[in-house]
């Protein structure tokens, strides 16, 4: 009983439940392969509880192990289109601070039009995650086709 | 020590750990694109702890942010088969109440025979999730090839 | 306040937050389809908190429902290569104890070069998970392309 009451009084943040789910805002300018994300209840079903957006890139606020997941669907795409525009690749990584830069997750589309994956990875406060899409096909902005999120799992 | 004791005395449900993993029961009749799911220890490794099944569709019992995941494999399928049939698409969405109807996750098979993805999304008590499979290829009922689940992540 | 202090004093293990993320070490000898995994901070971003490795296979230390996830990318692969070497299949299952042997997750590559999926499944202390790759194409050892992990979700 005491625990239940205490739990209700504590802010969720103290439990470390940082979580975010983002939708695609736009692609970068010509030489910038990054996808730019947005989130918040006004936009639909995307949200940020803990992490923040910094110029469309996701910045982590709490150290810990995170589940990172992503799905990207190419717009106006068929298996023929995809194979003719090969290679299209998506990479998720820590892009800043530069000292921690690393690729966490990488997938190629080959003859498919959607990639989806997830992984566990340690992230630190201040890490900014970037999602780089290389290739000549545009990603879909439909919120059920392209999304990116993180979930804090444990310290 | 006191916390550990209190935690042990509390039912898991009060911690909000709602979770379900379902296996395919059957497809719908001709005009019904929905997949019908089943779960429970008697069926193998599927289970429902919190959410319930309502005529083969998953109904949420606790408000919160959920990780929704799905894998669907088409039966007797090859890349040739997949390309020779009408585009097969899977969509996961809230189908009731009607006021909250929305597509959460959508994937096309293109020349592949399996789709798998996951996302974080807010769900409310009473939301029913439907998984719509459009196309003319049957989904596999093998429990390691086709499954659908949700995991409560935070309030 | 009391709750927060108690929580900090408890070892994480008592909360049941077992988690592991592994990277590919090597493939098995000729008649052994298993992938052999490795993990630990010295290797990069892989880790084991609770589960252990037993001759390259992941052994569970705590009963519960786990989220199991995997991504495997085939090395030096294109959709042409993949279709010419078909079928290449990945299966994740409990391989010991023999009495609990079962396939949990199965995917074929078809014309793709990467598979990625995840599922919830009950696992018991002592369960060893094996990942069997059948086919004639080598998996990539790049840590952002091939990885395997589990996350304890609830009892």
């Amino acid at each position: 009983q005491r625990f239940a009451q205490a739990q209700q009084q504590l802010p969720l943040e103290s439990l470390g439940w940082d979580v975010a789910e983002l939708q695609l805002n736009h692609t970068g300018p010509q030489q910038d392969p990054r996808l730019y994300w947005q989130g918040g209840p006004a936009l639909g079903r995307s949200f940020l509880h803990g992490p923040e957006l910094d110029k469309g890139q996701l910045r982590i606020h709490r150290d810990g192990i995170y589940m990172v997941h992503i799905q990207v669907t190419l717009a106006i795409c068929s298996s023929t289109t995809a194979s003719r525009h090969h290679p299209t690749t998506l990479a998720v990584g820590i892009c800043s601070p530069a000292s921690r830069s690393i690729s966490l997750l990488r997938l190629s589309f080959h003859q498919g039009c959607t990639i989806a994956s997830q992984r566990l990875t340690p992230l630190a406060r201040g890490d900014t995650l970037c999602t780089n899409l290389t290739g000549t096909l545009l990603p879909s902005r439909n919120t059920d086709e392209t999304f990116f999120g993180v979930q804090w799992v444990r310290p | 020590q006191r916390f550990a004791q209190a935690q042990q005395q509390l039912p898991l449900e009060s911690l909000g750990w709602d979770v379900a993993e379902l296996q395919l029961n059957h497809t719908g009749p001709q005009q019904d694109p929905r997949l019908y799911w089943q779960g429970g220890p008697a069926l193998g490794r599927s289970f429902l702890h919190g959410p319930e099944l309502d005529k083969g569709q998953l109904r949420i019992h606790r408000d919160g942010i959920y990780m929704v995941h799905i894998q669907v494999t088409l039966a007797i399928c090859s890349s040739t088969t997949a390309s020779r049939h009408h585009p097969t698409t899977l969509a996961v969405g809230i189908c009731s109440p009607a006021s909250r109807s929305i597509s959460l996750l959508r994937l096309s098979f293109h020349q592949g025979c399996t789709i798998a993805s996951q996302r974080l999304t807010p769900l409310a008590r009473g939301d029913t999730l439907c998984t719509n499979l459009t196309g003319t290829l049957l989904p596999s009922r093998n429990t390691d090839e086709t499954f659908f689940g949700v995991q409560w992540v935070r309030p | 306040q009391r709750f927060a202090q108690a929580q900090q004093q408890l070892p994480l293990e008592s909360l049941g937050w077992d988690v592991a993320e592994l990277q590919l070490n090597h493939t098995g000898p000729q008649q052994d389809p298993r992938l052999y995994w490795q993990g630990g901070p010295a290797l990069g971003r892989s880790f084991l908190h609770g589960p252990e490795l037993d001759k390259g296979q992941l052994r569970i230390h705590r009963d519960g429902i786990y989220m199991v996830h995997i991504q495997v990318t085939l090395a030096i692969c294109s959709s042409t290569t993949a279709s010419r070497h078909h079928p290449t299949t990945l299966a994740v299952g409990i391989c010991s104890p023999a009495s609990r042997s079962i396939s949990l997750l199965r995917l074929s590559f078809h014309q793709g070069c990467t598979i990625a999926s995840q599922r919830l499944t009950p696992l018991a202390r002592g369960d060893t998970l094996c990942t069997n790759l059948t086919g004639t194409l080598l998996p990539s050892r790049n840590t952002d392309e091939t990885f395997f992990g589990v996350q304890w979700v609830r009892p």
């Epitope: - | 395919l24 497809t27 007797i76 020779r84 003319t136 049957l138 596999s140 | -």
Partner: antibody, heavy 119, light 111 residues
Framework: EVQMVQSGAEVKKPGASVKVSCKAS????????IHWVRQAPGQGLEWMGD????????SYNQKFRDRVTMTRDTSTSTVYMELSSLRSEDTAVYYC????????????WGQGTLVTVSS | DIVMSQSPDSLAVSLGERATINCRAS??????????MHWYQQKPGQPPKLLIY???NLESGVPDRFSGSGSGTNFTLTISSLQAEDVAVYYC?????????FGGGTKVEIK
């Protein structure tokens, strides 16, 4: 209501070709594969092949591979089955058929077209 | 190719009695949680009519006196209480792989 209406009976000489049509209505033509099945007089049923009207891809029974061609015209929702180098044993009723939800079994059939091969 | 063998070739049953037709595949037609076996009824001068799909599913509009069972290589079509309008030839068909093949047919008559 799904309907499959086939062209009329044909009489052909050995070595000639025949082209049978099947006009589909009552559903989205490009969605469902259309199969061809034949039945010789007093005999059983034999699957010849199928075509996906969405892109025109066809798959043929190896037995007929060198002699059969299946095509479609999406503007008229019609599929065609052409069989060449006809011989007397090709005398049969030729049916087109499609399915109601999933491919593999045939819920809707044409009325059949009798092709007689005789010198 | 998978060879489908039907038995018997013909069957005479009294009105109201049970009729049973068997179909054997040369190798298993069951996979992915389904048995890819289907049954048709054909009357003279008509195209076949789907009765049962995936071994045991009754097609919409088909009387429930028709039922199907079996898995792997052995399948059965049962007419629980034969009616006059059930006089016809019955065919089994598999769709496990290409080419699809049919059984040779069983002629059902009234005794």
């Amino acid at each position: 209501e799904v309907q499959m209406v086939q062209s009329g009976a044909e009489v052909k000489k050995p070595g000639a070709s025949v082209k049978v049509s099947c006009k589909a209505s009552g559903y989205t033509f490009t969605t469902y594969n259309i199969h061809w099945v034949r039945q010789a007089p007093g005999q059983g049923l034999e699957w010849m092949g199928d075509i996906y009207p969405g892109n025109g891809d066809a798959s043929y029974n190896q037995k007929f591979r060198d002699r059969v061609t299946m095509t479609r015209d999406t503007s008229t929702s019609t599929v065609y089955m052409e069989l060449s180098s006809l011989r007397s044993e090709d005398t049969a009723v030729y049916y087109c058929a499609t399915f109601s939800r999933f491919d593999g079994w045939f819920a809707y059939w044409g009325q059949g077209t009798l092709v007689t091969v005789s010198s | 190719d998978i060879v489908m063998s039907q038995s018997p070739d013909s069957l005479a049953v009294s009105l109201g009695e049970r009729a049973t037709i068997n179909c054997r595949a040369s190798r298993s037609v069951s996979t992915s949680g389904y048995s890819y076996m289907h049954w048709y009824q054909q009357k003279p001068g008509q195209p076949p009519k789907l009765l049962i799909y995936l071994a045991s599913n009754l097609e919409s509009g088909v009387p429930d006196r028709f039922s199907g069972s079996g898995s792997g290589t052995n399948f059965t079509l049962t007419i629980s209480s034969l009616q006059a309008e059930d006089v016809a030839v019955y065919y089994c068909q598999h769709s496990r792989e290409l080419p699809y093949t049919f059984g040779g047919g069983t002629k059902v008559e009234i005794k």
